[in-house]
């Protein structure tokens, strides 16, 4: 066993990963209490899976239980053989109850697809165990779902192509098994932050994969490159979407959570980020008029630089329910930014700033902000995130995004923040000053800013208001207006046109 065994918190449980295999244990040795691994004194657990057809938007309604070989409930509960059929598959559970996201998702599906069959796969008895045991049960549950689908296929008019499996966390891999075991190919699987532990790097047949359905789309919201990644980091679908880089979700930081929870813990942060995938999917169902778009990119850093806002060759797609089938792609990583709550949609802009001279920059990177002024609204002051460093005599690309639709952009205010915000920067500034005491103030020159809208794919060039004044220095601002050539359209499709 390795000497340094990182302790990684998973909800309020801890998992000890050594030599690649998780050995769960809990605080004060009470894991058994937490997870209710059945003891001798407890009633014997039936290793069973139930299928509940949700016949009403009312979450309190008991619905109808379906079982293989029994056709009467299908008739009694008006199962629509020709309609879409959704199977919602929950994940591992510490409480043994259906969590509140479930009825939100059921309700959203009923709202969006009024004639559809919405089936909840209840595998709580098999999921309410040690995580490792629940993982081992996923295959069994997948088989049960496949058996149900095989039986339904025997009925007239039922088509596997109309089946959409929606699996959250561990449930995403259950969906993968179901898709793998069924006779034929299911229409679609959506993986909502598929579980990471014991699946990361696993063989294609032991996790969700593009082979499991005609179209597999995945939302990753809790991935971590350090510590334990609750959600799987690797791409496992035809398209894999990583909102906000797939890790830190807005509104889920400790500060946000503690703001509303007096005694909040890391538990709430984990739940918030992991469950965000479900809410993004719900958002895509209920806010059809506010679709969020994701853009193909090789990695999160390149996306943060604003390099990847193209819709050419199917490089962008709606996220969630409205995603377009992309069967020719596999493991295509896509990125987007979102708001902290519903509706999650933001408006992405690529900003290309050519810095043509650069005076006395010293060691520290400048801090820039932009304010965008549009025909509909003006943005807040937006930070320009410098991913690497500002390059001189080069075009520097940035990503900015706004929560509101600004309409057509009219002008841009670029501000160079004056005061250093941290002691570290202050010290670097001071050291820089000591090493170059005779140098005048820092300054750089910018003639124009090129802006591209991710959502409309339109490009526009902005020039300095005063062609003679192109310099900016700390504490100063520079104004840019639309250049005379105005809007320049490329032969790039607008994603709004591509909505299904």
């Amino acid at each position: 066993m390795s000497n340094s065994v990182p302790l990684l918190c998973f909800w309020s449980l801890c998992y000890c990963f050594a030599a690649g295999s998780p050995v769960p244990f809990g605080p004060e040795g009470r894991l058994e209490d937490k997870l209710h691994k059945p003891k001798a004194t407890q009633t014997e657990v039936k290793p069973s899976v139930r299928f509940n057809l949700r016949t009403s938007k009312d979450p309190e309604h008991e619905g109808c239980y379906l079982s293989v070989g029994h056709s009467q409930p299908l008739e009694d509960c008006s199962f629509n053989m020709t309609a879409k059929t959704f199977f919602i598959i929950h994940g591992w559970t510490m409480s043994g109850i259906f969590e509140n996201w479930l009825h939100k998702l059921v309700s959203a599906l009923h709202t969006r697809e009024k004639d559809a069959n919405v089936v909840v796969v209840d595998w709580l008895p098999l999921a309410h165990q040690l995580y490792t045991d629940a993982v081992n049960n996923t295959r069994v549950v997948g088989h049960s779902i496949a058996r149900m689908l095989d039986w339904l296929q025997e009925k007239d008019d039922f088509s596997l192509g109309n089946v959409h499996l929606i699996g959250y966390s561990l449930g995403a891999h259950v969906a993968g098994y179901a898709g793998n075991f069924v006779k034929g190919t299911v229409g679609r699987i959506t993986g909502l932050d598929p579980a990471g532990p014991m699946f990361e790097g696993a063989d294609i047949h032991k996790r969700l994969s593009p082979d499991d359905a005609d179209f597999v789309d995945v939302l990753h919201t809790y991935t971590r490159s350090f510590g334990l990644s609750i959600g799987i980091q690797m791409p496992v679908g035809h398209i894999d979407i990583y909102p906000n880089g797939g890790d830190f979700q807005p509104g889920c930081g400790l500060n946000d959570v503690l703001g509303s929870i007096a005694y909040g813990t890391i538990t709430e942060v984990v739940k918030c980020e992991h469950e965000r995938a479900v809410h993004l999917f719900v958002d895509s169902l209920v806010n059809q008029d506010k679709p969020s778009f994701a853009f193909q990119c090789t990695d999160s850093n390149r996306f943060k630089k604003g390099i990847c806002l193209s819709c050419r060759k199917n490089r962008c797609n709606s996220i969630g329910y409205n995603a377009k089938k992309m069967r020719n792609k596999r493991n295509s990583k896509m990125y987007l930014k979102t708001r902290a709550g519903m509706p999650f949609r933001v408006y992405h802009y690529q900003m290309k700033i050519h810095v043509f001279s650069y005076k006395n920059m010293g060691e520290i990177e400048p801090t820039f902000y932009v304010t965008l002024y549009g025909t509909n609204a003006d943005s807040q002051t937006l930070p320009l995130e410098i991913v690497e460093r500002i390059e001189q005599n080069a075009t520097n690309t940035f990503l900015v995004y706004t929560e509101e639709d600004l309409g057509d952009l009219l002008k841009i205010q670029l501000t160079w923040e004056g005061a250093s915000q941290s002691w570290y920067n202050l010290w670097k500034e001071f050291r820089s000053y000591l090493s170059q005491p005779r140098n005048p103030g820092r300054e750089l020159n910018i003639r124009r800013i090129r802006v591209k809208s991710g959502e409309t794919q339109r490009k526009l060039t902005f020039c300095t208001e005063d062609p003679e004044n192109t310099s900016i220095s700390p504490g100063r601002e520079l104004w840019f207006r639309k250049c005379r050539d105005g809007w320049r359209m490329k032969n790039e499709t607008s994603p709004t046109v591509e909505l299904p």
């Epitope: 069973s48 979450p59 239980y65 109850i97 259906f98 996201w101 939100k104």
Partner: antibody, heavy 120, light 112 residues
Framework: QIQLVQSGPELKKPGETVKISCKAS????????MNWVKQAPGKGLKWMGW????????TYADDFKGRFAFSLETSASTAYLQINNFKNEDTATYFC?????????????WGQGTALTASS | DIVLTQSPASLAVSLGQRATISCKAS??????????MNWYQQKPGQPPKLLIY???NLKSGIPARFSGSGSGTDFTLNIHPVEEEDAATYYC??????????FGGGTKLEIK
């Protein structure tokens, strides 16, 4: 109509075992979870835990781990609460109450309660 | 565990007037726009009876003079106009995703 009918009051000596029942009617027993709630004389309500009526898996609140056991007789649509090694502080009225698995988990129907008293 | 604190512990209200009972949670009981707070009425020798679920939804069959409001950590049960039969003890309860599902200490309502 929906009803939860509990067994009658009992007088128990400390150290004894007691088992009270809650018989459900008017709905499909296995489609709703069953809670147990304690109310000591003149005091408030205290949630003891719940049992999944389909799988039989119980969940206990921290204060009720050890001497308390929930069980089922599914064929009779009945849930049971057993208290081992009865103590004076177990003197209370115990209620069963159902909740929907799929909804917001409020307790929509309650049994009439079973009073348990410690006799010296 | 989420602790629910009810106030006042008891109150006396004249017939026809308004009774207001408060319930404060030690942490938010909200989830995605819904509040997982319920209110029950208990009369002596009887089991509790559900009045309000999800903070403001009236259970069918409960008179409209009962209403619930609030979100996050602060919730209120209002009874207006108070009637003789409303003399009882009222409890708030949270049913968030993570049990234990806790009750408030109760508020005893007397009719003057």
């Amino acid at each position: 109509q929906i009803q939860l009918v509990q067994s009658g009051p009992e007088l128990k000596k400390p150290g004894e075992t007691v088992k009270i029942s809650c018989k459900a009617s008017g709905y499909t027993f296995t489609n709703y979870g069953m809670n147990w709630v304690k109310q000591a004389p003149g005091k408030g309500l205290k949630w003891m835990g719940w049992i999944n009526t389909y799988s039989g898996v119980p969940t206990y609140a921290d204060d009720f781990k050890g001497r308390f056991a929930f069980s089922l007789e599914t064929s009779a649509s009945t849930a049971y609460l057993q208290i081992n090694n009865f103590k004076n502080e177990d003197t209370a009225t115990y209620f069963c109450a159902r909740f929907s698995y799929y909804g917001r988990h409020y307790f929509d129907y309650w049994g009439q309660g079973t009073a348990l008293t410690a006799s010296s | 565990d989420i602790v629910l604190t009810q106030s006042p512990a008891s109150l006396a209200v004249s017939l026809g007037q308004r009774a207001t009972i408060s319930c404060k949670a030690s942490q938010s009981v909200d989830y995605d726009g819904d509040s997982y707070m319920n209110w029950y009425q208990q009369k002596p020798g009887q089991p509790p009876k559900l009045l309000i679920y999800a903070a403001s939804n009236l259970k069918s069959g409960i008179p409209a003079r009962f209403s619930g409001s609030g979100s996050g950590t602060d919730f209120t049960l209002n009874i207006h106009p108070v009637e003789e039969e409303d003399a009882a003890t009222y409890y708030c309860q949270q049913t968030t995703d993570d049990p234990p599902w806790t009750f408030g200490g109760g508020t005893k309502l007397e009719i003057k």
